[in-house]
């Protein structure tokens, strides 16, 4: 039975050329984490498997590094990041937990982190 | 080419063993987590056993949990399934799979090798 | 466990024609759902993941769709090389578990 909880850094915003850390945390559960996936819609951004480390797709090699922790940085914001994000833990005998984030980068210098939530 | 072929199977009396073998070509083996699945005469598919890329996690279904060991030789880049106390209905064809990067689904499947238990 | 039915068992279609296959999860699997091909004495082909995502190779004219319980897998034109039968899998949680399979068949 799934019986953990994922907790994210929830609505967050950031500026336009600058970096943002994308986390998300595991609880309630002694599930074995066998891989952690990072994803924009259905893309595929980040991988951190237990056995190989990370992974950074291709594509988002420039602009995304791993962690801190399971976390992901995006880093040289542009107006197009904006969007969902997910983090979906791979687990066992669990199965798959998800956790979503939005992202908005904001042409101002005005940009507040959103606070905490829960998602089942 | 992506390749996987299983081979070991056979005729065995109940209470016996079997070591079924997956060997992978065309990729590279050490990145990839591998499963048995098998499919009994007349029955659906069913997912048998995982093991993670580098061989530190081990996942089996209950109904062979304690008899059934998955194991892998990332050297020789070949899968093991070693199958012990078999059952009659243990009988089935046995598939090696890998499992896709991202851990969504099994995206290369071998043809199988068939494992019939009886006496 | 999770329980997968597939429906329907079986389908007589023609080629050129539109078909649906169905499953329906005993439980929310989120979109967590492949759709895989088989042909006799083949090894099963992974056409589509995640619900929806569609797996490198595969023709544009197989889809899916669906999440939570109830799934469908869409041939938008049938092809000669697409009579085969056609298994859904659960990927949301262990054991991983499949539907009874659907024979699709030349009418």
């Known amino acids: 039975m799934m019986t953990g909880t994922i907790e994210t850094t929830g609505n967050i915003s950031a500026e336009k050329g600058g970096s943002i850390i994308l986390q998300c945390h595991l609880s309630s559960t002694t599930a074995q984490v066998t891989q952690v996936n990072w994803e924009q819609q259905d893309q595929l951004l980040a991988i951190c498997n237990a056995d190989l480390g990370w992974h950074i797709s291709p594509s988002f090699k420039d602009r995304v590094a791993p962690g801190p922790g399971l976390g992901l940085t995006l880093q040289s914001l542009t107006v197009n990041d904006t969007g969902e994000y997910f983090c979906i833990y791979h687990t066992y005998p669990d199965g798959t937990y998800t956790g979503r984030i939005f992202l908005e980068v904001l042409e101002s210098s005005v940009a507040e982190h959103g606070a905490r939530f829960q998602i089942p | 080419e992506v390749q996987v072929v299983e081979s070991g199977g056979g005729l065995v009396k109940p209470g016996g063993s079997l070591r079924l073998s997956c060997a992978a070509s065309g990729f590279t083996f050490s990145t990839y987590a591998m499963s048995w699945v098998r499919q009994a005469p007349e029955q659906r598919l069913e997912w048998v056993a995982e093991?993670?890329?580098?061989?530190?996690?081990?996942f089996y279904s209950d109904t062979v949990t304690g008899r059934f060991t998955i194991s892998r030789d990332n050297a020789k880049n070949t899968l093991y399934l070693q199958m012990n106390s078999l059952r009659a209905e243990d009988t089935a064809v046995y598939y090696c799979?890998?499992?896709?990067?991202?851990?969504?689904?099994?995206?290369?499947w071998g043809q199988g090798t068939t494992v019939t238990v009886s006496s | 466990d999770v329980q997968i039915t597939q429906s329907p068992s079986s389908v007589s279609a023609s080629v050129g024609d539109r078909v649906t296959i169905n499953c329906r999860a005993s439980k929310s699997i989120s979109k967590y759902l492949a759709w895989y091909q088989q042909k006799p004495g083949k090894a099963p082909k992974l056409l589509i993941y995640?619900?929806?995502r569609l797996q490198s190779g595969v023709p544009s004219r197989f889809s899916g769709s669906g999440s939570g319980t109830d799934f469908t897998l869409t041939i938008s034109s049938l092809q000669p090389e697409d009579f085969a039968t056609y298994y859904c899998?659960?990927?949301?949680?262990?054991?991983?578990?499949f539907g009874g399979g659907t024979k699709l068949e030349i009418k």
């Open positions: 093991i993670s890329s580098g061989g530190s996690h081990t």
């Open positions: 899998q659960q990927h949301n949680e262990y054991p991983w578990t």
């Open positions: 799979a890998r499992k896709t990067l991202d851990y969504y689904a099994l995206d290369y």
């Open positions: 995640s619900g929806s």
